[in-house]
């Protein structure tokens, strides 16, 4: 089958890093500078991606693979293959059209990217708030109020009091 295919289409024999050159009677030609073909049988080589401005090069282009970009410090990637760079914010903030804004009360963001999310509603799970939420951290839910009734306390009991008249050594 491979042989039949190559007899029908000479371009199918062109390996990665080359293209099927119509100007040369369909013989395989190496990709010109700053272009690549990552698969065989290509009729053109693709222009290498250039990581400019807020993008920086994570992997150089070669004749068989495209360049890969990431973002300069203070920015993070968005989209497939890091097609966009978005500004970082601080924890406790989210990026709006007007820039980084603090999370509203009742919401938090523990990352430098993304949006502020509501604190967990502990009562929905029948639990109580053990640690209050902040702009940077979600609340920590603890045992349900019922669990804290006398005799069922999960809180560590206080240390026994010393007997009177005994001073520490």
């Amino acid at each position: 089958f491979e042989r039949t295919r190559s007899l029908q289409d000479p371009c199918s024999n062109c390996p990665a890093g080359t293209f099927c050159d119509n100007n040369r009677n369909q013989i395989c030609s190496p990709c010109p500078p700053n272009s690549f073909s990552s698969a065989g049988g290509q009729r053109t080589c693709d222009i290498c991606r250039q990581c400019k401005g807020v993008f920086r090069t994570r992997k150089e282009c070669s004749s068989t693979s495209n360049a890969e970009c990431d973002c300069t410090p203070g920015f993070h990637c968005l989209g497939a293959g890091c097609s966009m760079c978005e500004q970082d914010c601080k924890q406790g903030q989210e990026l709006t059209k007007k820039g980084c804004k603090d999370c509203c009360f009742g919401t938090f963001n523990d990352q430098k990217r993304g949006i502020c999310r509501p604190w967990t509603n502990c009562s929905l799970d029948g639990k109580s708030v053990l640690v209050n939420g902040t702009k940077e951290r979600d609340v920590v839910c603890g045992p349900s109020p019922a669990d804290l009734s006398p005799g069922a306390s999960s809180v560590t009991p206080p240390a026994p009091a010393r007997e009177p008249g005994h001073s520490p050594q």
């Epitope: 890093g17 190496p30 990709c31 010109p32 500078p33 700053n34 070669s62 004749s63 068989t64």
Partner: nanobody, 111 residues
Framework: AVQLVESGGGLVQPGGSLRLSCAAS????????WSWYRQAPGKQRELVAW???????HYTDSAKGRFTISRDNTKKTMYLQMNSLKLEDTAVYYC?????WGQGTQVTVSS
């Protein structure tokens, strides 16, 4: 323009070796892709081995493991070391860079 002259072809028995040379003259410093092609009687010219613009050596399936491309920039020369030659390697071998071609050197593998 760049001028290319191949040498080193000849008659060799199956299993033998040859080393082809391609001497370049002219403004070679702008050239970033160097290739060896071959053309067997009655067949289309085909790519054998090449230095890509990223300086990495590449080989087509027919050359992998048997042929080695190299170059000496100080001598403006590219080489093709061909080992374990087969009858089907018989062809005229051409050196290429950009639009420049050498005149070719004949390689005949015969017992």
């Amino acid at each position: 323009a760049v001028q290319l002259v191949e040498s080193g072809g000849g008659l060799v028995q199956p299993g033998g070796s040859l080393r082809l040379s391609c001497a370049a003259s002219g403004n070679i410093f702008s050239i970033r892709v160097w290739s060896w092609y071959r053309q067997a009687p009655g067949k289309q010219r085909e790519l054998v081995a090449w230095f890509a613009w990223d300086n990495i050596a590449h080989y087509t399936d027919s050359a992998k493991g048997r042929f080695t491309i190299s170059r000496d920039n100080t001598k403006k020369t590219m080489y093709l070391q061909m080992n374990s030659l087969k009858l089907e390697d018989t062809a005229v071998y051409y050196c290429n860079s950009g639009d420049s071609w050498g005149q070719g050197t004949q390689v005949t593998v015969s017992s």
